[in-house]
């Protein structure tokens, strides 16, 4: 016995973030000695699926013809060779978008901001959520992740940026999600173009603090469920 078998590689095509109803293929790549591949989904009876290897036996395909809520989650795969089962792959997180209606994204006081000033991006959802994600197109670290610490659900989250520099300029979208499954996201908001004028440069800008608020009825129209308590939010760069 020459030690444990190397872990396989797990990935999804066309990617790991899939819109409701679209197809996705999960690939597990092991070694040429593989006889069988197994895919496990967290919190599902194992194995979630088994497949024979495709020639030349070093990988297997797991097909999802139409993405739904049931397929969203965290996966690992294994392969079996004549000497036994491999180590598990690194996890693959398959996220479904389109689980909820799109939030709306606004820039306050305006999407036209002077370098050195402050701007707040406000993401508002139709139904109360406890996680909000802000995406910037073509950014090295595109995801700003706000999650309620206490599970309190909010209709909106604020992403303050101060001081603003030219690096903050670009196209943003936001998503919302429920705590019971962070693998289920809303449709993306309509894009918001943040335009920064002026010449102050700062190569490492970042939002200062991130807060979720429950505005009163006059501040946020149509919160028919009533006001919800303020809660602290953790900020995560991913």
């Amino acid at each position: 016995q020459a030690g444990p078998l190397p872990k396989p590689t797990l990935w999804a095509e066309p990617g790991s973030v899939i819109s409701w109803g679209n197809s996705v293929t999960i690939w597990c790549q092991g070694t040429l000695e593989a006889r069988e591949y197994r895919l496990d989904k967290e919190e599902s009876p194992a194995p979630w699926d088994r497949q024979n290897p495709l020639e030349p036996k070093n990988k297997a395909r797991f097909s999802i013809p139409s993405m739904t809520e049931d397929y969203a989650g965290r996966y690992r795969c294994y392969y079996r060779s004549p000497v036994g089962w491999s180590q598990p792959s690194d996890p693959l997180e398959l996220v479904m978008t389109g689980a909820y209606s799109k939030p709306t994204l606004s820039a306050l006081p305006s999407p036209l901001v002077t370098s050195g000033k402050s701007v707040t991006l406000l993401c508002q959802s139709r139904s109360p959520m406890d996680t909000f994600l802000l995406i910037k197109e073509r950014a090295a670290h595109p995801l700003l992740h706000l999650r309620s610490e206490h599970g309190a659900q909010q209709h909106q989250a604020e992403f303050p940026m101060s001081p603003v520099t030219s690096v903050h300029g670009g196209t943003y979208r936001c998503f919302s999600s429920h705590g019971f499954s962070h693998y289920l996201l809303s449709h993306p908001s309509d894009p918001l173009e943040l335009i920064v004028s002026g010449s102050l440069e700062d190569p490492r800008p970042s939002p200062t603090r991130s807060v979720s608020t429950a505005a009163g009825p006059e501040d946020q129209p149509l919160m028919p469920t009533g006001s919800v308590p303020h809660s602290g939010l953790r900020r995560h760069w991913e």
């Epitope: 809520e69 209606s101 406000l122 508002q124 139904s127």
Partner: antibody
Framework: QVQLVQSGAEVKKPGASVKVSCKAS????????IDWVKQPPGKGLEWIGY????????SYNQKFKGRVTMTVDKSTSTVYMELSSLRSEDTAVYYC??????????WGQGTTVTVSS | DIVMTQSPDSLAVSLGERATINCKSS????????????LAWYQQKPGQAPRLLIY???TRESGVPDRFAGSGSGTDFTLTISSLQAEDVAVYYC?????????FGQGTKLEIK
């Protein structure tokens, strides 16, 4: 594509009840509010209320409260609107519509309800 | 309840000409929280369900021709069809979604002159 398919036309007598269905497909059913809108013949649109399939939460226009009940069957992705104590002024086309952010981005084809003795 | 009033009730415009429909709300639809106007426009052709054209007063729904444009803020809003086509014959409704109950304008019937 998003589709909301409603049940067929109904003719009812005054005092009776009617139950209209709206079957959704082409999207994640549980996460979108479904509203009902009334349109009397040759007239405008009037909001009746909504139901949130995920939780069953409802909210009704005060004008219809006590006479309207909205329910959901998640297993068939169908919502229902029942209107009781029908009167002649309830004669209308009833639409179900999917809410985006309180506005409606998809509509059913409509169900004609005629109340006549 | 917020009352929505459209004008005119009916309108006849020549093909290729501009059509303008107005909508007035009994209170402001501009939110202080996000600086957005909670107003949508719908088109309803004879025998059909309404179709969303515009939301947030000026954002065109996907697939809607760019000859349709929404404008206005606060209590006064306008739907403009820049060059009327035969298929635009319909009744047009504005809707406020600032507060419950959701309310619609009475509709404007658009015909070809």
């Amino acid at each position: 594509q998003v589709q909301l398919v409603q049940s067929g036309a109904e003719v009812k007598k005054p005092g009776a009840s009617v139950k209209v269905s709206c079957k959704a497909s082409g999207y994640s059913f549980s996460g979108f509010y479904i509203d009902w809108v009334k349109q009397p013949p040759g007239k405008g649109l009037e909001w009746i209320g909504y139901i949130f399939p995920s939780s069953g939460e409802t909210s009704y226009n005060q004008k219809f409260k006590g006479r309207v009940t909205m329910t959901v069957d998640k297993s068939t992705s169908t919502v229902y609107m029942e209107l009781s104590s029908l009167r002649s002024e309830d004669t209308a086309v009833y639409y179900c519509a999917r809410q985006a952010f309180y506005y409606f981005d998809s509509w059913g084809q409509g169900t004609t309800v005629t109340v006549s003795s | 309840d917020i009352v929505m009033t459209q004008s005119p009730d009916s309108l006849a415009v020549s093909l290729g000409e501009r059509a303008t429909i107005n909508c007035k709300s009994s209170q402001s639809l501009l939110s202080s929280s996000n600086q957005k106007n909670y107003l949508a426009w719908y088109q309803q052709k004879p025998g059909q369900a309404p179709r969303l054209l515009i939301y947030w007063a000026s954002t065109r729904e996907s697939g809607v021709p760019d000859r349709f444009a929404g404008s206005g803020s606060g209590t006064d809003f306008t739907l403009t069809i820049s060059s009327l086509q035969a298929e635009d014959v319909a009744v047009y409704y504005c809707q406020q979604y600032y507060s419950y109950p959701l309310t619609f304008g009475q509709g404007t019937k658009l015909e070809i002159k």
